[in-house]
């Protein structure tokens, strides 16, 4: 806390300019009017203040705006944003995407901080939903942003926003998140033709049900093994050997290398060995020939 002292004669700041970098902390406190600072915030980031001096400027703004800064000030915070606590940010009302971008730029190249998480939360809540422009901006700065949201939060993403999602944005999503995103993606891309549709929907297929995988197998999509390995096990199990062969196309040979990993391992256990043998890959572990397969879940449903 900088103690209150009178401003020395001739040092009263008439504008925010670079001469202020030579002021001691107490001189900044005494000689810079908070209202002047607020109206000339756009100049602050262009001036190489020390971090101690930035503390003084923040203190002045806090005194002027105890209920939270106006957006005209927030937009020009620059490095001063890094001095803000989540508690400070919770008082803000940020509605402009330009303001959001300006503050995310300060944080660029670093992990998402509690400050940024709070800022995004305030912004999205203010907008009511994650619209395309916001999602575009957030995933540009934080590719993992989508996967940091809960399934409940993802439910507020409109299908139109899915166009902004890049494959790498989904790298860390778990099946529960993909379960929410997949139907939105299906809806968003529904008017595309077969090959284009597959390119777009591929990253979301970890949320696809069996019937959609069966449909894809009829379209010569040649799914790669990396995508296949991310599919829901419960969606893969009902697929026949012929359907998997059609789904993977030339990539079917990759099943051998993955035969001990899910979902391939569990799928093999559900197939007849003679069907697996038709692939010519040497896959082992299928149901021996002559054995009868009882689907107990079906039996329970009937009783």
């Amino acid at each position: 806390e900088v103690e209150k002292t009178a401003c020395p004669s001739g040092k009263k700041a008439r504008e925010i300019d670079e001469s202020l970098i030579f002021y001691k902390k107490w001189e900044l406190e005494a000689c810079v009017d908070a209202a002047l600072l607020a109206t000339q915030m756009d100049r602050v980031n262009a001036i190489p203040f020390t971090y101690e001096q930035l503390d003084v400027l923040k203190h002045k703004l806090d005194e002027l705006y105890p209920q939270g800064y106006p957006e005209s000030v927030i937009q020009h915070l620059g490095y001063l944003f890094l001095k803000m606590s989540p508690e400070d940010i919770r008082k803000w009302n940020v509605t402009s995407l330009e303001t959001l971008k300006a503050l995310l730029e300060v944080n660029k190249g670093h992990e998402m901080s509690p400050q940024v998480a709070t800022l995004i939360d305030r912004f999205v809540k203010g907008r009511g939903q994650l619209d395309k422009d916001t999602l575009d901006t957030l995933t540009a700065f934080y590719p993992g942003y989508l996967c940091s949201l809960s399934p409940e939060e993802l439910s507020s993403v409109p299908p139109s926003s899915i166009w902004a999602v890049r494959p790498q944005d989904l790298d860390t999503c778990d099946p529960r998140q993909l379960d929410v995103l997949y139907p939105k993606a299906r809806l968003a891309f529904q008017n595309m033709n077969g090959s284009e549709y597959f390119v777009k929907i591929q990253s979301f297929l970890g949320g696809a049900p069996t019937e959609d995988l069966k449909a894809l197998s009829q379209q010569n999509v040649s799914m790669d093994l990396a995508t296949f390995m991310k599919l829901r096990t419960d969606a893969v199990l009902p697929l026949t050997v012929a359907e998997v062969q059609k789904l993977l196309g030339p990539h079917v040979e990759g099943l051998k290398a993955e035969e001990r990993h899910r979902p391939v391992r569990d799928w093999i256990l559900r197939q007849r060995q003679d069907d697996l043998d038709t692939l010519g890959l040497g896959l082992q572990g299928g149901i021996p020939n002559g054995y009868l397969v009882l689907d107990l879940s079906m039996q329970e449903a009937l009783s």
């Epitope: 190489p48 020390t50 101690e52 890094l82 001095k83 300060v106 944080n107 670093h110 901080s113 940024v116």
Partner: nanobody, 123 residues
Framework: QVQLVESGGGLVQAGGSLRLSCVAS????????MRWYRQAPGKERELVAV???????IYLDAVKGRFTISRDNANNAIYLEMNSLKPEDTAVYVC?????????????????FGQGTQVTVSS
């Protein structure tokens, strides 16, 4: 952590020249502004000159036209060319660098200082 090492100080007659160097090592990425401060015996430390990452320089009025600060980003170094030295320039000259540092709580603003190099100007 950033380590700053100054060199180039010494004893010089009034009107003479010196060139101070400051080299940063360690975590030098994200260094923003670099500065030269000086502290004379019994006086407060004062900022002499600052140079931004982009090379923009600002000087204390008392040294304008006599001192030149420059920066070599590739070698993480700054220099202070001091001409027409006066006895009142006598002080320990200290290099400073500020950088944005990633921490678990998000990026933080940190300041680093060197040990300083003595400049003595005799009349």
């Amino acid at each position: 952590q950033v380590q700053l090492v100054e060199s180039g100080g010494g004893l010089v007659q009034a009107g003479g020249s010196l060139r101070l160097s400051c080299v940063a090592s360690g975590s030098t990425s994200n260094i923003n502004n670099m500065r030269w401060y000086r502290q004379a015996p019994g006086k407060e430390r004062e900022l002499v000159a600052v140079i931004t990452r982009g090379g923009y320089a600002i000087y204390l009025d008392a040294v304008k036209g006599r001192f030149t600060i420059s920066r070599d980003n590739a070698n993480n170094a700054i220099y202070l060319e001091m001409n027409s030295l006066k006895p009142e320039d006598t002080a320990v000259y200290v290099c400073n660098a500020d950088r944005v540092e990633g921490t678990s709580g998000g990026p933080q603003l940190r300041d680093y200082f060197g040990q300083g190099t003595q400049v003595t100007v005799s009349s």
